[in-house]
Interface confidence: low
């Protein structure tokens, strides 16, 4: 027979020879990092037809790490479904619980004994500290000291101490999230008041009022012979400015001009009218409408100062 077969998990005892006599036996031992479990044979014999009798390394098992139980309220998931050295154990917590400790343990050889790289983690219930207090407002369950997973609080603004109300900027409801963090930042309560929008050679067609607070929406159209430069719909944003800016009504020039042809007084030159939702995330316009001389109208900076009781 020629040289005996080689295996991943076991190695020949002694040095191989170039050839072997019929009936000659060779023995194997498990390689380092593997251990022998009887009764499978770890030897073979050169058969009379010049081949080695069948033998396999199935008796040599890789060193494995100790069994790890699922953590309470979680799972231990062996990567590749094995506890053998060189592989990982992943830990996952059930919804509403979070991991304290290592998310991954490694089955490592210390010498040739397989041990885990650390202690298994534990799954703790997700708890949130009370959400932030806000100026000029409050939230529900303000007396509660500890909140559980998915517990929600709703913010509301205090009644304003002056003539203008506080507006709630942001989402009113937040909840305790899966990593003990509230789902989003707390909203703001502040006075939001936009200047009276004046459009010369045009008129307001909706959203009438003397005061314009947060999210107030106003629509315009131009007088006959004038066309709209800007958006026909504007919204009072959280910075007390109109978004988009207050439009202008410009005179329609004769057809010989390179200016746009005469347009219907209700047509806007802007291709689309932004909705309040889309404008909120877009860039803020740099144009500031002129300060109105509307009687008795306070400048925005003269509004009520935010104060925390």
């Amino acid at each position: 027979c020629e040289e005996p077969p080689t295996f991943e998990a076991m190695e020949l005892i002694g040095k191989p020879k170039p050839y072997y006599e019929i009936g000659e036996r060779v023995d194997y031992k498990c390689k380092k990092g593997y251990f022998y479990i009887p009764p499978l044979a770890t030897h073979t014999i050169c058969d009379r037809n010049h081949t080695w009798l069948p033998v396999s390394d199935d008796a040599c098992y890789r060193e494995t790490c100790p069994y790890i139980r699922d953590p309470l309220n979680g799972q231990a998931v062996p990567a590749n479904g094995t506890y053998e050295f060189g592989y990982q154990m992943h830990f996952i917590c059930n919804e509403g619980y979070y991991l304290i400790g290592e998310e991954i343990l490694y089955c490592e050889l210390k010498g040739s004994v397989a041990i885990w790289s650390g202690k298994p983690p534990i799954c703790e219930k997700v708890l949130c500290t009370p959400p932030p207090k806000i100026k000029n407002g409050k939230h529900t369950f303000s007396e509660v000291e500890v909140f559980e997973y998915l517990d929600a609080v709703t913010y509301s603004c205090d009644p304003a101490p002056g003539p203008d109300p506080f507006s709630l900027i942001g989402e009113s409801t937040i909840y305790c999230g899966d990593n003990s963090v509230w789902s989003r930042a707390a909203p703001e309560c502040k006075v939001v008041k936009c200047r009276f929008p004046v459009v010369e050679n045009g008129k307001q067609i909706s959203g009438f009022g003397k005061k314009f607070y947060y999210k107030a929406t106003v629509m315009f159209e131009c007088d006959k012979g004038f066309y709209l430069d800007g958006s026909d719909t504007i919204v009072c944003d959280s910075n007390s400015t109109w978004d988009p800016p207050v439009p202008k009504c410009l005179k329609v020039l004769p057809p010989s001009s390179t200016k746009p042809p005469a347009l219907s007084h209700s047509v806007s030159t802007s291709s689309t009218t932004k909705s309040p939702a889309s404008s909120a995330s877009g860039p803020r316009p740099t144009y500031k409408p002129p300060v109105s001389n509307y009687p008795g109208y306070p400048k925005p900076e003269e509004g009520i100062l935010d104060s925390l009781d």
Partner: antibody
Framework: QIQLQQSGPELVKPGASVKISCKAS????????INWVKQRPGQGLEWIGW????????RYNEKFKGKATLTVDTSSSTAYMQLSSLTSEDSAVYFC???????????????WGARTTVTVSS | GIKMTQSPSSMYASLGERVTITCKAS??????LSWFQQKPGKSPKTLIY???RLVDGVPSRFSGSGSGQDYSLTISSLEYEDMGIYYC?????????FGGGTKLEIK
């Protein structure tokens, strides 16, 4: 004969990255961990981390997390270490070494690569 | 990490002399300690593992001892080829840490 053959010297500019290699021969590459060790001129040795080629699992010294990335290509029995955002502090000699199991509870670094010198200079 | 303090940092010794180098760990390393020899321009070579076990092929004049936090490497009779830098390494806890080295020179 068991050998670890390291790639040649590297001269790299600050801020760049470099990938050095360690080619194993004479044994089953996937059965033994490969460690990487750093030695700055005239200074001692620092353990960077290891990789287990059988699974690709890695373990890093916290000091080198984000600096060194260890990988293997089992088809060519080669371990690699990539060093990123290089500074003069990374100018050093780097060794790869095999983690040999000497029986229950025992192991040691039995075979070392010959060294790769990395010089960071503009 | 565990700090490994080697002493002395350098020493001179005569041929045939008995030489001892020590390594102190900042905490118990459970005998997971190796000793290495490094010659100029060469890779380190492992001499001892698990505190006192001699690597195959290493001359028997080298020996290791110790437990807990305190370990030592002894060369029973110094030979010329023994000059170089000696390092200890703890591999009980991550990150593995080396001692600062002991430079051994011949008087």
């Amino acid at each position: 004969q068991i050998q670890l053959q390291q790639s040649g010297p590297e001269l790299v500019k600050p801020g760049a990255s470099v990938k050095i290699s360690c080619k194993a021969s004479g044994y089953t590459f996937t059965d033994y961990y490969i460690n990487w060790v750093k030695q700055r001129p005239g200074q001692g040795l620092e353990w960077i981390g290891w990789i287990y080629p059988g699974s690709g699992n890695t373990r890093y010294n916290e000091k080198f997390k984000g600096k060194a990335t260890l990988t293997v290509d089992t088809s060519s029995s080669t371990a690699y270490m990539q060093l990123s955002s290089l500074t003069s502090e990374d100018s050093a000699v780097y060794f790869c070494t095999r983690y040999y199991y000497a029986g229950r509870y025992d192991w040691y670094f039995d075979v070392w690569g010959a060294r790769t010198t990395v010089t960071v200079s503009s | 990490g565990i700090k490994m303090t080697q002493s002395p940092s350098s020493m001179y010794a005569s041929l045939g002399e008995r030489v001892t180098i020590t390594c102190k760990a900042s905490q118990d390393v459970n005998s997971y300690l190796s000793w290495f020899q490094q010659k100029p321009g060469k890779s380190p070579k492992t001499l001892i593992y698990r505190a006192n076990r001699l690597v195959d092929g290493v001359p028997s004049r080298f020996s290791g001892s110790g437990s807990g936090q305190d370990y030592s490497l002894t060369i029973s009779s110094l030979e010329y080829e023994d000059m170089g830098i000696y390092y200890c390494l703890q591999y009980d806890e991550f990150p593995y840490t080396f001692g600062g080295g002991t430079k051994l020179e011949i008087k």
